[in-house]
Amino acid sequence: EEELQVIQPEKSVSVAAGESATLNCTATSLIPVGPIQWFRGVGPGRELIYHQKEGHFPRVTPVSDPTKRNNMDFSIRISNITPADAGTYYCVKFRKGSPDVELKSGAGTELSVRAKPS
């Protein structure tokens, strides 16, 4: 297996309520094959925010073309941010399997939400 790193360059991001938040994530390799998922929080209670291969996430849009065969940019944009979205978001690489196996997580990006400017 090649060494793979998941890089979340920003430790924190601050966004005004009602705006969109961009959470950056890149992988250094596509191997081993398997999906990327985004979570808020850690542990068994973590919340799935985006799954590369399945699910409906109406507020989440990939920043780069996810259908590119050589895509290693797994950044996402979350629209219409509210205070309830605050938290630490993790970009996690999985290796294919039944079920998929968690391989490596980014360091996390803390999203804070500012009050809407009046």
């Epitope: 094959v33 073309d65 259908t67 065969r69």
Partner: antibody, heavy 117, light 108 residues
């Protein structure tokens, strides 16, 4: 229902060109990568070319420089321009929708290209 | 790139279990699928992502992988399952799709 309908095949002479089309319906075409796969008479399947939703293109070595894949998301149509055709290009050409990991989940019925002098 | 190798033919009696193998890819860099093709028809995907069955495919079709070999299993084979079956792979190193040579399944 997902539907893929190819057209544009025919009989041509060696060195000539064709443009194959694949009209799709039943899903959001602009969100999916697509591919062309061909099958020579009595032979197996051969992947020819793929294109991402944003237009990045990929080809098998044997057709690089001769074939060009493209798409028009506003027309829900996939294309394959095939130039400098040889007898070895004689095949049924299928368009196929790609899964998130570049396998295929839906296929068209195919269009036959025959190259003969 | 790599080659995917399948047996040219497999024969099975109705109601029995058919297993078709495919070898040659690198497990860590390759996703696999199985495509069914009946004479004069277009291929139909019966398994993708190694073991995922499309919703309209009967449950008797299943996929599995072990090391560099993937297997299509058809439990309780029916006469209508007689077809050519192609193993397909997508290689994340080369960005290329590859197919095996196909296996003719005969239902005796």
């Amino acid at each position: 229902d997902v539907q893929l309908v190819e057209s544009g095949g025919g009989v041509v002479r060696p060195g000539e060109s064709l443009r194959l089309s694949c009209a799709v319906s039943g899903f959001r075409f602009s969100s999916y990568a697509m591919s062309w796969v061909r099958q020579a008479p009595g032979k197996g399947l051969e992947w020819v070319s793929g294109i991402s939703s944003g237009g990045d293109t990929y080809y098998v070595d044997s057709v690089k420089g001769r074939f060009t894949i493209s798409r028009d998301n506003s027309k829900n149509t996939l294309y394959l321009q095939v130039n400098s055709l040889t007898a070895e290009d004689t095949a049924i050409y299928y368009c196929a929708r790609e899964t998130w990991n570049h396998l295929f989940d839906y296929w068209g019925l195919g269009t036959l290209v025959t190259v003969s002098s | 790139s790599y080659e995917l190798t399948q047996p040219p033919s497999v024969s099975v009696s109705p109601g029995q279990t058919a297993r078709i193998t495919c070898s040659g890819g690198d497990y860590y860099s390759t996703y696999y699928a199985w495509y069914q093709q009946k004479p004069g028809q277009a291929p139909v995907t019966v398994i993708h992502s190694d073991d995922k069955r499309p919703s309209d495919i009967p449950e008797r079709f299943s996929g599995s992988s072990s090391g560099t070999t993937v297997t299509l299993t058809i439990s309780g084979v029916q006469a209508e399952d007689e077809a050519d079956y192609y193993c397909g792979g997508y290689d994340g190193r080369t960005y290329i799709n590859t197919f095996g040579g196909g296996t003719k399944l005969t239902v005796l």
